[in-house]
């Protein structure tokens, strides 16, 4: 039938950060090509990445249409140069992906401290509100727009002279913390979605320390 050397894809894996979502699979193709289809549980299949020799397919455009939906993808294998050929049952070989719900499963990207400002013994730390590829009314939504109060940030802060890290939490993008006068502090933030069961935390932001250019100091 011309499919004797065609193998089904395997190890289908979703790789997703801040809703940028790619489906990866194996094996690297030898004399075969792949096409990917994606669907919601109740929707129709949509084909993407037609007859590709890649082992990944960017499905971001599809999943951002409704990040709270659950998606299923499948990868079809075709003989190279003979994509009309089918398997023994009259269908091309294919393998299903695990289900994927972007809102619950996309990894939280590394946050960035936008700025910090000291006024006396208070420091205001602001986290950058990262833009996602989720659109509403033709504009890209930020992470906060998408997750709302489900998204919190944990601030780790410590005196430059010590290692113990105090914590603070916010469900905005700003922290207001008390600091000791005359001490320099360092800061790092972590995004958290407490309502999740998996992928609850982001990696920590790069560390920012007082006395460096991102910060501002005002004595009152």
């Amino acid at each position: 039938s011309g499919t004797t050397n065609t193998v089904a894809a395997y190890n289908l894996t979703w790789k997703s950060t801040n809703f940028k979502t790619i489906l990866e699979w194996e094996p690297k193709p030898v004399n075969q090509v792949y096409t990917v289809q994606i669907s919601t549980k109740s929707g129709d299949w949509k084909s993407k990445c037609f007859y590709t020799t890649d082992t990944e397919c960017d499905l971001t455009d599809e999943i951002v249409k409704d990040v709270k939906q659950t998606y299923l993808a499948r990868v079809f294998s075709y003989p190279a140069g003979n994509v009309e050929s089918t398997g023994s049952a009259g269908e091309p070989l294919y393998e299903n992906s695990p289900e994927f719900t972007p809102y619950l499963e996309t990894n939280l990207g590394q946050p960035t401290i936008q700025s910090f400002e000291q006024v006396g013994t208070k420091v205001n730390v602001t986290v950058e509100d990262e833009r996602t590829l989720v659109r509403r009314n033709n504009t890209f939504l930020s992470l906060r727009d998408v997750f709302g109060k489900d998204l919190i940030y944990t601030l780790y802060y410590w005196k430059s002279s010590s290692s113990g890290k105090k914590t603070a939490k916010t469900n905005t993008n700003e922290f207001l913390i008390d600091v000791d006068k005359g001490e320099n502090y360092c800061f790092s933030v972590q995004a958290v979605i407490p309502s999740r069961t998996v992928n609850r935390k982001s990696t920590d932001s790069p560390v920012e320390c007082m006395g460096q250019e991102k910060g501002e100091f005002r004595e009152i």
Epitope: K149, I152, T154, Y156, S163, G164, K165, K166, T167, A168, K169, T170, N171, D178, Q190, V192, P194, T197, V198, R200, K201, T203, D204
Partner: antibody
Framework: EVQLVESGGGLVQPGGSLRLSCAAS????????IHWVRQAPGKGLEWVGY????????YYADSVKGRFTISADTSKNTAYLQMNSLRAEDTAVYYC??????????????WGQGTLVTVSS | DIQMTQSPSSLSASVGDRVTITCRAS??????VAWYQQKPGKAPKLLIY???FLYSGVPSRFSGSRSGTDFTLTISSLQPEDFATYYC?????????FGQGTKVEIK
Amino acid sequence: EVQLVESGGGLVQPGGSLRLSCAASGFTLTGYWIHWVRQAPGKGLEWVGYIDPYNGATYYADSVKGRFTISADTSKNTAYLQMNSLRAEDTAVYYCARADYYYVDEYWDYWGQGTLVTVSS
Amino acid sequence: DIQMTQSPSSLSASVGDRVTITCRASQDVNTAVAWYQQKPGKAPKLLIYSASFLYSGVPSRFSGSRSGTDFTLTISSLQPEDFATYYCQQHYTTPPTFGQGTKVEIK
């Protein structure tokens, strides 16, 4: 089923060391925060310190700073409390507890059964 | 550090009584207060979180409230299994701190 099981307590001489373990099951340690709390005989609860197993961040109560170290082995899903230079006043039942958030408010929903540490000559 | 001043330190009550325990924070802690119940030889158990939310599986006779920096745990009708020690805890700032505890005894 979520569970925290402590072990490693016992009798130790002043100045000695002990390592307590807190083995977690039913959840992945890295998704949460682990606190250690102690309770001296007939007394109230005293916070000892915490670890974020995801990034290794720690902080300690002044009473144990420089003597106690909290760590985690994520491959074993276990947190540890290394106690050095032990004093009689460290005698207590030691608990580990899992911290989670409701929005920004933290709560400690699961606790270990406790392990008794007695510092005496 | 934030102090949590809990009162009374002990109380005697009868089954069916309404019991109120209070905690005062030394500074603003927003709603970052939890209440725990502890029985002799056992680990503490979470009752109330975020000042007023009843933890899953906890009987509805337990409730929590906040007024500024004052926090209250109320048991509407004391049951035999409620005789225990109760602790408030703030986690608004590091380090988290506990109240001294309130022992609820049988009258």
